[in-house]
Interface confidence: low
């Protein structure tokens, strides 16, 4: 915390301007009125304050707004945003996309992922849902930021907005996030023809259930191996050799390359070796001929 002192009369501040860069930290603390600072926040970013001086200004705003800054201040934070912690941002109520854009621009090139994720979360809460304008802003100014949102927040995305999401926006999404987004994408693209549908749904398939993957195998989609490898393990395991062959089409040869990787490895272990041999790829590790497969989980459930 900054030491409290009395402001010397000659240092009294009547407006926020460049003269303040010469003030020592304790002079800024003593001489800058927090209400004046808040009213003239739009000037702060044009003044080359040191990070230590920005700490003082932040401290003053924190004292003035202990429950969180108003959006009129947030909008003009500029590089002062770099001083904000996720805990600070969690107190904010942000509804303006102009505010979001301004702060996303400031954060570029700085390690601010935690702060940006919290900011986006506050915008979604403030706006009531993850609407198309918000998604468009995120994809334009913060590619990949969509994945910083929790599954709960992503559940507020209307299916109509899904079309604005690009494949690269989903690169860092986890399984639980794709589980939320996939059904929305399926709904959003349901009226498209087979090949067009597959191109659109492909980035979301990490959230697809077995029955949908099986359905795709009947549509000659020729799924690439990279997409296949991102499918849920649970979605892949029940597929038959014939279904995987149909699903991958000419890309089926890639299974040999991925033979030791999940989900391919786990899938191989579930197939009869006879069936795997029909692919002619030399895949090994299937259930040997003549072996009986007992589903012990049924017995365990009964005992």
């Amino acid at each position: 915390d900054v030491e409290r002192t009395t402001c010397p009369p000659e240092k009294e501040v009547h407006e926020i301007d460049e003269s303040l860069i010469f003030y020592k930290k304790r002079e800024l603390e003593a001489c800058v009125d927090a209400a004046l600072l808040a009213a003239q926040m739009d000037r702060v970013d044009a003044i080359p304050f040191t990070y230590e001086q920005l700490d003082v200004l932040k401290h003053k705003l924190d004292e003035l707004y202990p429950q969180g800054y108003p959006e009129s201040v947030i909008r003009h934070l500029g590089h002062l945003f770099l001083k904000m912690s996720p805990e600070d941002i969690r107190k904010w109520n942000v509804t303006s996309l102009e505010t979001l854009k301004a702060l996303l621009k400031v954060s570029k090139g700085h390690e601010m992922s935690a702060q940006v994720a919290t900011l986006i979360d506050r915008v979604v809460v403030g706006r009531g849902q993850l609407d198309k304008d918000t998604v468009d802003t995120l994809t334009a100014f913060c590619p990949g930021c969509l994945c910083s949102l929790s599954p709960e927040r992503l559940s507020s995305v209307p299916p109509s907005v899904i079309g604005a999401v690009r494949p690269q926006d989903l690169d860092t999404c986890g399984p639980r996030q794709l589980d939320v987004l996939y059904p929305k994408a399926r709904l959003a693209f349901q009226n498209m023809s087979g090949s067009e549908y597959f191109v659109k749904i492909r980035p979301f398939l990490g959230g697809a259930p077995t029955e949908d993957v099986k359905a795709l195998s009947q549509q000659n989609v020729s799924m690439d191996l990279a997409t296949f490898m991102k499918l849920r393990r649970e979605a892949v395991l029940p597929l038959t050799v014939a279904e995987v062959q149909k699903l991958l089409g000419p890309h089926v040869e890639g299974l040999k390359v991925e033979e030791q990787h999940s989900p391919v490895r786990d899938w191989i272990l579930k197939q009869r070796q006879d069936d795997l041999d029909t692919l002619g790829l030399g895949l090994q590790g299937g259930i040997p001929n003549g072996y009986l497969i007992l589903d012990l989980s049924v017995r365990e459930a009964l005992s």
Partner: nanobody, 117 residues
């Protein structure tokens, strides 16, 4: 198949820093999202940080603001800068491709990070 070799671990005091590196072989490295994972004794392996092919990053709550993931596609390397380390960060750290959906059985040896109090 991409081969991954992690390095840079070691013993460090709480509050200290380490920089982990993960060197990858394979010409398609730059097109893969990459992830750093860790596994503490008796615990499940967890995703710590992810970086997309374009450089977008994502972090677990427990490391946000302390860890930074980055990549150098020219060197086929992904890094994890770990600052303000805590004893609870002690684990074996691994990197892998196709994050956060990761092959179960194609992990490297990992690199041990031990943070003493």
């Amino acid at each position: 198949e991409v081969q991954l070799v992690e390095s840079g671990g070691g013993l460090v005091q709480a509050g200290g820093s380490l920089r982990l590196s993960c060197a990858a072989s394979g010409s398609t490295f730059s097109s893969y999202p990459m992830g750093w994972y860790r596994q503490a004794p008796g615990k499940q392996r967890e995703l710590v940080a992810a970086i997309s092919s374009g450089g977008s990053t994502n972090y677990a709550d427990s490391v946000k603001g302390r860890f930074t993931i980055s990549r150098d596609n020219a060197k086929n390397t992904v890094y994890l800068q770990m600052n303000s380390l805590k004893p609870e960060d002690t684990a074996v750290y691994y990197c892998n491709t196709r994050s956060p959906r990761v092959p179960n059985d194609s992990w490297g040896q990992g690199t041990q990070v031990t943070v003493s109090s």
